[in-house]
């Protein structure tokens, strides 16, 4: 479960000739409100079809009366966000319709009159929990500027709001391979777990317990290459029993990419590579400059001071595409269990397992708890033929026999001083450095290499590492 949030920034005349007349006048004062309709997937349905993901109506904006002779300015907007709650998983791809409505406040018989001023629609790919995405849409002579995001409602987390947070079993840490739930730091993430044994290279899941195969693979665990020799066409859904590919239309048939975008098939859908100046799922958004914030996911926009000159997005690691709209990192789904390190090799995912674990997803624990004692108050944790000593604070090692000095490994970088602490260690950073282990330099202009220091901590303050 979660909430889709829409922030309208401006609604007014678009650039170019033929500015629209103001919708309000001294004789007919009016005010605006907005309606948003969301549908899952890349719906081509008519505007009248149900808003299956949900819909919302804004508050009424301030009353506006046109000044005689003045061009139509940006019109005054309602306060606040439009929020569309969704009950199930966030679908990742969605279609939207945003309508701008006018409420006339003259002396009409029977109360206010409503009329639709503009309707814009689009299709987007969006991960829940990500940053605000900015957009511009034009409807006739009007232009709408807005931002949107999807966020999960606790206890759901993850890019589809399908992973759940659960209370920690131990006060100081989460289990192996599980992260704390931001912003519920006292809870732990319960990862989306595919069917046990599902191939990490060729399988994936969108619902817990399933194992769906990438194109070209079949079998219960997606470990069997599809044989296409006896098939009519090497495309389409695979039959579970025969492993033969049934012919079907390709996602790029008829080129869904507008404005000269090139289409490439992906395992589950298609992807448009857009020429400069265009973006959106199908390259349908245009006339964009750096001022419009076209670079998603923290990309840096360079050039493009006016609509005719190209801009370039410099993407942060893990993102690509002309607008940094494509996520590269498949490890974000945390496929490696038991604290394994995920490596995205491009052609495949690999899990580098912690000592004592093995298997494609580090799902097998190699040890046996039977007859094993954990010293110094440590407890032996069983699971699937597995053993692990969970040591009391201050102790470590395989059997909790070693007295753990959290400062022994010199964890504080750049000359920071380390202090043992009941819950771990504290680094007191040298001037000019910050972070849990003093790993981040504070830039001379005052901005840090971190997105932000945690609330209540200034750069240079001691930071506890749990």
């Amino acid at each position: 479960a979660g909430v889709f949030e829409l922030q309208i920034h401006s609604f007014g005349p678009g650039p170019g000739p033929g500015a629209p007349r103001s919708p309000c006048s001294a004789r007919l004062p009016c005010r605006l409100f907005f309606r948003v309709c969301l549908k899952p997937g890349l719906s081509e349905e008519a505007a009248e079809s149900p808003c299956a993901l949900g819909a919302a109506l804004s508050a009424r904006g301030p009353v506006y009366t046109e000044q005689p002779g003045a061009p139509a300015p940006d019109l005054p907007l309602p306060d606040g966000l439009l929020q569309v709650p969704f009950r199930d998983a966030w679908p990742g791809t969605f279609s939207f319709i945003i309508e701008t409505w006018r409420e006339e406040l003259g002396d009409q018989i029977g109360g206010p009159a409503w009329s639709l001023l503009a309707r814009v629609a689009g299709r987007r790919r969006l991960a829940a929990g990500g940053p605000w995405a900015r957009d511009i849409q034009r409807a006739g002579a009007w232009e709408l500027r807005f931002s949107y995001r999807a966020r999960c409602e606790p206890p759901a987390v993850g890019t589809a709001c399908t992973r759940l947070c659960r209370p920690r079993s131990a006060p100081s840490r989460c289990g192996p391979g599980l992260r704390p739930c931001a912003p519920l730091e006292d809870e732990c993430e319960a990862p989306l777990v595919c069917r046990a044994g599902c191939s990490p290279e060729h399988g994936f899941c969108e619902q817990p317990g399933e194992c769906r195969c990438l194109e070209g693979w079949t079998g219960p665990l997606c470990t069997v290459p599809v044989s296409t020799s006896s098939c009519l066409s090497p495309r389409g859904p695979s039959s579970a029993t025969t492993g033969c590919l049934v012919p079907g239309p390709g996602p790029c048939d008829g080129n869904p990419c507008a404005n000269g975008g090139s289409c490439s098939e992906t395992p589950r859908s298609f992807e448009c590579t857009c020429p400069r100046g265009f973006y959106g799922l199908r390259c349908e958004v245009s006339g964009v400059t750096c001022a419009d914030g076209p670079c998603f996911n923290g990309g840096l926009c360079v050039g493009g001071a006016d609509p005719d000159s190209a801009y370039i997005c410099h993407c942060p690691p893990g993102f690509q595409g002309s607008n940094c709209e494509k996520r590269v990192d498949r490890c974000s789904l945390q496929p490696c269990r038991n604290g394994g390190l995920c490596l995205d090799l491009g052609h495949a995912l690999r899990c580098r397992c912690r000592a004592g674990f093995a298997g494609p997803r580090c799902e097998h624990d190699l040890d046996d708890c039977a007859g094993r004692a954990c010293a110094n108050g440590g407890t032996c944790v069983e699971g699937g033929g597995a053993h692990r000593c969970s040591c009391a604070l201050g102790f470590g090692g395989r059997d909790c026999r070693e007295r753990a000095d959290p400062c022994a490994a010199r964890p504080c970088a750049h000359g920071g001083r380390c202090y043992a602490h009941f819950s771990g260690l504290v680094c007191a950073c040298a001037p000019g450095y910050m972070g849990a282990r003093c790993e981040f330099p504070v830039h001379p202009d005052g901005a840090s290499a971190l997105p932000a220091a945690p609330p209540g901590l200034r750069p240079g303050d001691p930071q506890r590492y749990l």
Epitope: V193, R195, A196, G197, Q207, P208, G209, E210, T218, G219, P220, L221, T223, V224, A240, T241, G243, G359, E363, H364, G384
Partner: antibody, heavy 118, light 107 residues
């Protein structure tokens, strides 16, 4: 502790249908496949098919696909296996099993004996 | 369908013996093989998964090995409670298939 509890023994005439239930407790029902396996008297094990309760997705053994239907009632955490057009060679113990956190049938029901006799 | 051919079908052994059961797949199934133990009138119990990993609570005298088409279940020192029928199973391809079983009897 995970439990799968199956419905009681059934006696059916040839040509009839039988519907066996499997009620699951003490785990997240929607997240794990339920498998159906049968065992004729004195014989080995034969896989019939599977269903993932969270999605309703089913995969059937080709041998049974025209006669078997697997369904789920999430409100009661129960999976059903219906076999139609029964013949005498369908006399067997029918087991449900859960594909668990490791790649195997981790938990099994106690079995339901279905006898087909005229 | 993939055939899983188990041998021997019957095996007589004494307490303390080392027992080996083999299972041959008619085509490559990687390491996607499990072993189960079944006693008369009871449901099968899981022993080994992914060819060589012991399931929770299974004694260390049970071990599995192999890959591709040849798989082995070994009981290093047979105990009285081990007299039962053992089945291999492949879950690499649909339909999932079991071996015909090996009945381990007291000599």
């Amino acid at each position: 502790q995970v439990q799968l509890v199956q419905s009681g023994a059934e006696v059916k005439k040839p040509g009839a249908s039988v519907k066996v239930s499997c009620k699951a407790t003490d785990y997240i029902f929607s997240n794990y496949y339920i498998e159906w396996v049968r065992q004729a008297p004195g014989q080995g094990l034969e896989w019939m098919g599977e269903i993932l309760p969270g999605t309703g997705n089913t995969v059937y053994n080709e041998k049974f696909k025209d006669r078997v239907t697997m369904t789920v009632d999430t409100s009661t955490s129960t999976v059903y296996m219906e076999l139609s057009s029964l013949r005498s060679e369908d006399t067997a113990v029918y087991y449900c099993a859960r594909w668990g956190d490791y790649a195997l049938f981790a938990n099994w029901g106690q079995g339901t004996l279905v006898t087909v006799s005229s | 369908d993939i055939q899983m051919t188990q041998s021997p079908s019957f095996l007589s052994a004494s307490v303390g013996d080392r027992v080996t059961i083999t299972c041959k797949a008619s085509q490559n199934v990687g390491t996607n093989v499990a072993w189960y133990q079944q006693k008369p009138g009871k449901a099968p119990k899981p022993l080994i998964y992914s060819t060589s990993y012991r399931y929770s609570g299974v004694p260390s005298r049970f071990s599995g090995s192999g890959s591709g088409t040849e798989f082995t279940l070994t009981i290093s020192s047979l105990q009285p409670e081990d007299f039962a029928t053992y089945y291999c199973q492949q879950y690499n391809n649909y339909p999932l298939t079991f071996g015909g079983g090996t009945k381990v009897e007291i000599k």
